[in-house]
């Protein structure tokens, strides 16, 4: 029950996270004009990964796509790539995890297969979350660098004259959405990996099976299980005359699919 809950919660958290990563990638407000020195402005500029926008005081907004591919900064291209990789991995992870959910029965799928799929999706979610966090962090670092460079330029103009012409950009809403979404996807992935441990069948020690001869009390103890049981040196099938007495290890047991949680 706990495993199913962990897996289900991991799936839901990852789903929310990936939806957030998609939203952040599509959002225009990755960087917004810094209004600290100029709170009353006729126009407000903000930029996304795909286009830049200008909003007038009237509320009218005009956006322009970055129609060039080669002219864009390498860092912006890298951020785009990281976010897209994150979305793709997350989407595949979601698809895999749907089939891995314990509450969904698909044919006669083994629990071991579900465990493997859960682990795969978990790893995909972790990588997806890391991609999103990395992408957002790279962009944030780019903004911080540019912000302080433009601040330095502002106050070290010609002959120390103050220049307030340059527009400085600060963190936009998309960055926070991206960080939170990446974190959620990461957490969801970790939860899926934890759930996988509970789903995976533990190495079942198939105990030796005792067979009783009709005439004599003879138990045949196959020794071929040495590797899996870690017991004695019964490499050949030795006859053991024990008068029909059986140790606890020798009690006949059949592996059941309910033997493990």
């Amino acid at each position: 029950m706990a495993v199913t809950a962990c897996q289900g919660l991991g799936f839901v958290v990852s789903l929310i996270g990936i939806a957030g990563i998609i939203a952040a990638t599509c959002m225009d407000q990755w960087s917004t004009q810094d209004l600290y020195n100029n709170p009353v402005t006729a126009v407000f500029n903000y930029q996304g990964l795909w286009r830049s926008c200008v909003r007038e005081s009237s509320g009218f907004t005009e956006c322009r796509g970055y129609f060039t591919l080669l002219g864009l900064p390498a860092m912006l291209q890298a951020v785009r790539a990281l976010m897209i990789v994150g979305i793709v991995l997350g989407a595949i992870g979601l698809l895999v995890s749907i089939f891995a959910l314990k509450c969904i029965r698909i044919g006669s799928m083994e629990d071991s297969a579900k465990a493997n799929m859960t682990l795969t999706s978990g790893i995909m979610f972790i990588v997806s979350g890391l991609c999103a966090i990395a992408g957002v962090s790279v962009f944030a670092n780019m903004l911080v660098t540019n912000f302080w460079m433009s601040t330095a330029n502002m106050y070290t103009g010609m002959g120390g004259m103050v220049q307030t012409v340059q527009t400085r950009y600060t963190f936009g809403a998309a960055l926070f959405v991206g960080w939170v979404a990446g974190g959620l996807t990461l957490i969801g992935g970790v939860m899926m990996c934890i759930a996988c441990r509970g789903l995976a069948p533990e190495e079942t020690n198939y105990k030796a099976v005792s067979y009783h001869a009709s005439g004599h009390s003879v138990a045949y103890k196959p020794g071929g299980f040495k590797a899996s049981t870690g017991f004695g040196s019964n490499t050949k099938n030795k006859k053991i005359y024990d008068g029909g007495a059986r140790t606890e290890d020798e009690v006949q047991s059949y592996p059941s699919k309910h033997d493990y949680v």
């Epitope: 006729a42 126009v43 200008v54 007038e56 009218f60 005009e62």
Partner: nanobody
Framework: QVQLDESGGGLVQPGGSLRLSCAAS?????MGWFRQAPGKGLERVAN????????WLADSVKGRFTISRDNSKNTLYLQMTSLRAEDTAVYYC??????????????WGQGTLVTVSS
């Protein structure tokens, strides 16, 4: 150079209607209407992107004004209904070559006066 000729202004009673027209000498990227009330600054009213027909209307006129265009005639229209006294202003037709932003407006009309009074 693009020539813009406005028409349709005049005196109208509150609650009445008017239709302003603006004919451009050639096609532009964007066309719109701005207005300037007596003693006030220039205010954007509405605009339309000529290529795809995307429109924008100021909150103060939403539900009352509609903007439309006829690309074959390079003409812009502003249908004004339920007019109020605060709509009294000189209405300017504007056109942009590559942007609709006020700072990027390349061409302006001479303006047409709309007076809403009983």
């Amino acid at each position: 150079q693009v020539q813009l000729d406005e028409s349709g202004g005049g005196l109208v009673q509150p609650g009445g209607s008017l239709r302003l027209s603006c004919a451009a000498s050639r096609s532009t990227y964007c066309m719109g209407w701005f207005r300037q009330a007596p003693g006030k600054g220039l205010e954007r009213v509405a605009n339309v992107y000529m290529r795809n027909g995307d429109t924008w209307l100021a909150d103060s006129v939403k539900g009352r004004f509609t903007i439309s265009r006829d690309n074959s005639k390079n003409t812009l229209y502003l249908q004004m209904t339920s007019l109020r006294a605060e709509d009294t202003a000189v209405y300017y037709c504007a056109a942009g070559r590559s942007s609709c932003l006020e700072a990027s407006i390349s061409y302006w009309g001479q303006g047409t006066l709309v007076t809403v009074s009983s």
